[in-house]
Each structure stands twice: as C-alpha cells, then as structure tokens.
Interface confidence: medium
C-alpha cells in the first residue's frame, strides 16, 4: 500500500485584508481512521485553527463536505482575514484514539501573507 500523504499544494498564499483565505489540503488515503486538524505554527506553541472532530470555529468553513464517507479533501476557508492571521498553516492528520488521538502526519505547510486592504 502507498504511504498516506498529506498534501498542501500551495507553499504560500497572499490575501487582501478583509477577504477570505482558502488553504488547501488533501489526503491520499482514508486510513488510518482519525480526524484532521489545522494549526497555525508548529511545535508546542502552535495554535489550533480547526478541529474536524469538535469545537466551534466561526471564521472557518470547510470547502467540501467532510462527513462524506470517501472525502479526501480537507481544505478550509478562513473569513475576514486580518494581518494578525499571517503565518504558516499546517494540515495535520491524527490517528483516532480513546480518549486521546495521536498525531500521524503533517502537511508541509502553507504560508499565509496578508496584503493591505485596497483603498
């Protein structure tokens, strides 16, 4: 079997302040079972942006229907971008656990830069 890959096709995206940013992510396999999460930054201080399993993320919408049985697209859109949103975003696959999931593999990251709002 092929190794699961977490593909973030864009190394960087640039968005004007006030617009929405689409961050793309796709998996190459449905296995292992478990959720995906989006983070800004890496390491211990990373910030959770979206958790497929639980939580309320009012500015984040998923590009495709994640509950579809064979969905492999985990792209997200973040609305009303501000300069504070700049950073590198990682799409991370977790392996399902009870009570704790364990990280399986991360995408390479997409750097989001924010342009000034056009006047």
């Amino acid at each position: 079997e092929d190794e699961l890959q977490v593909i973030q096709p864009e190394k960087s995206v640039s968005v004007a302040a006030g617009e929405s940013a689409t961050l793309r992510c796709a998996m190459t396999s449905l296995i292992p079972v478990g959720p995906i999460m989006w983070f800004r930054g890496a390491g211990a201080g990373r910030e959770l942006i979206y958790n497929q399993k639980e939580g309320h993320f009012p500015r984040v919408t998923t590009v495709s229907e994640l509950t579809k049985r064979n969905n492999l697209d985990f792209s997200i859109s973040i609305s009303n971008i501000t300069p504070a949103d700049a950073g590198t975003y990682y799409c991370v696959k977790f392996r399902k656990g009870s009570p704790d999931d364990v990280e399986f593999k991360s995408g390479a990251g997409t750097e989001l830069s924010v342009r000034a709002k056009p006047s």
């Epitope: 079997e1 092929d2 190794e3 699961l4 396999s29 296995i31 292992p32 079972v33 392996r95 399902k96 656990g97 009870s98 704790d100 999931d101 364990v102 990280e103 399986f104 991360s106």
Partner: antibody, heavy 124, light 107 residues
Framework: QVQLVQSGAEVKKPGASVKVSCKAS????????MVWVRQAPGQGLEWMGI????????SYAQKFQGRVTMTRDTSTSTVYMELSSLRSEDTAVYYC?????????????????WGQGTTVTVSS | DIQMTQSPSSLSASVGDRVTITCQAS??????LNWYQQKPGKAPKLLIY???NLETGVPSRFSGSRSGTDFTFTISSLQPEDIATYYC?????????FGGGTKVEIK
C-alpha cells in the same frame, strides 16, 4: 540490525514511581510509533499507550490516564515510560515495541520489533 | 474501547494436528487484526498482520482469515516449537486492545 534495548529490572515500594527506558537502533527513530505493553505474572498482554517520536504526541489507555507519562529523546533515540503511584498490581514485565508500518505503509500494522522486557516488582 | 474475545483460552493437540483459534471483535475493525506468538519468558513475536498476511520469515503453516468481525488463526500442522501462547490484537483504533490469549500445549 533493528533492536530495542530496555533498562534493567526495578524493585519499588508502593506509592513510588518507576521510569523505564527503551533505546532504539538500526532504523530511523522518528519514523515509527513506539508502544508500551505490560504483562503481569501469568497474565495476558495489556496495551498501555503509544508515542509518536516525531512530534512527541501520546495516547494512553484509559486505565493508566494520570499515572503514566511517555516521553522521548530524539538525540539518543530513546523512549521513556514513567508510571507513578505504584501498587502491587503493577508488578509486571514492561515491554516497549515498535509499531511497524508508519513511514512506508499507509497505516501502522502491528508491533514488529520488541524490547527484551523490564521486570518491575512493587513490594513493601 | 474495542473488545477482543479470544477462544479457547487453552488447548492441547498432538504434533501434526490442525489447530484453530478464534477472535471476535466487538465492532467492525476491517482487516486490522494481528496475531502474535509468545513463548515462555520471551517477548511476543508478530506472526500475521492485516488478518491474513504472514510476517516475513514466518512459516507457511501459520495462516489467518476474516469473516466480518470474526477472525481465525490456524496452524495447519502443529510442531513442537509451536508450543506458546497466541494473542490477537486490533490495530484500527487506539487503545490497541489484545485478546485474552490462547495457550497451546502438546498432548
């Protein structure tokens, strides 16, 4: 060759803690999960938890939540399992084992390499 | 947690006999089941993964199969060196639970 070498036998008093080490060699340490399994005398195998050496994330069996801590040191390719508030029922052989598959298959598939086991005796 | 019910807990058979051990999962685990052999005083050894795939170097007399949530482990012709305890384990969802084990002895 691929191997896991564990620390030596330990004798502890009830209420104490024990920290068992497991040194990996012969493969890329961060490319495979490591699990801990224990076996009480005359009993079956009991899965305790798992650590992803790459990022350090862990998942523990509910039974051990709050008492077990699994860590790793990538510079020495070593994982550690610390069990606190020991009681007599924790007397067992503790094994570390590599979960094969992560890194070259789509998903992990089982413990393909095991340490030799560390006997922990809890007695007053 | 996923429960794995293994039977029998022990069995006695003659050299050359066909030996069968079963394991039932409490929910669908697809093919994500392993079988291990453990000899006294030794660490377990992975024999079969993904329900039916033989690990490298394992003799072909060992085999595994699946029917829904029921899994079967077979030794086609029992050898003296097969005296051990055998365990099933699911690996689809953490915690990776084991069956209770089956001790195989020679008559």
């Amino acid at each position: 060759q691929v191997q896991l070498v564990q620390s030596g036998a330990e004798v502890k008093k009830p209420g104490a803690s024990v920290k068992v080490s497991c040194k990996a060699s012969g493969y890329t340490f961060t490319s495979y999960y490591m699990v801990w399994v224990r076996q009480a005398p005359g009993q079956g195998l009991e899965w305790m938890g798992i650590i992803n050496p790459s990022g350090g994330s862990t998942s523990y069996a509910q039974k051990f939540q709050g008492r077990v801590t699994m860590t790793r040191d990538t510079s020495t390719s070593t994982v550690y399992m610390e069990l606190s508030s020991l009681r007599s029922e924790d007397t067992a052989v503790y094994y570390c084992a590599r979960e094969g598959g992560y890194g070259y298959r789509a998903y992990p598939y089982g413990m393909d390499v095991w340490g030799q086991g560390t006997t922990v005796t809890v007695s007053s | 947690d996923i429960q794995m019910t293994q039977s029998p807990s022990s069995l006695s058979a003659s050299v050359g006999d066909r030996v069968t051990i079963t394991c039932q999962a409490s929910q669908d685990i697809s093919n994500s089941l392993n079988w291990y052999q453990q000899k006294p005083g030794k660490a377990p050894k992975l024999l079969i993964y993904d329900a039916s795939n033989l690990e490298t170097g394992v003799p072909s007399r060992f085999s595994g199969s699946r029917s829904g949530t029921d899994f079967t482990f077979t030794i086609s012709s029992l050898q003296p060196e097969d005296i051990a305890t055998y365990y099933c384990q699911q690996v689809i969802i953490l915690p990776l639970t084991f069956g209770g084990g089956t001790k195989v002895e020679i008559k």
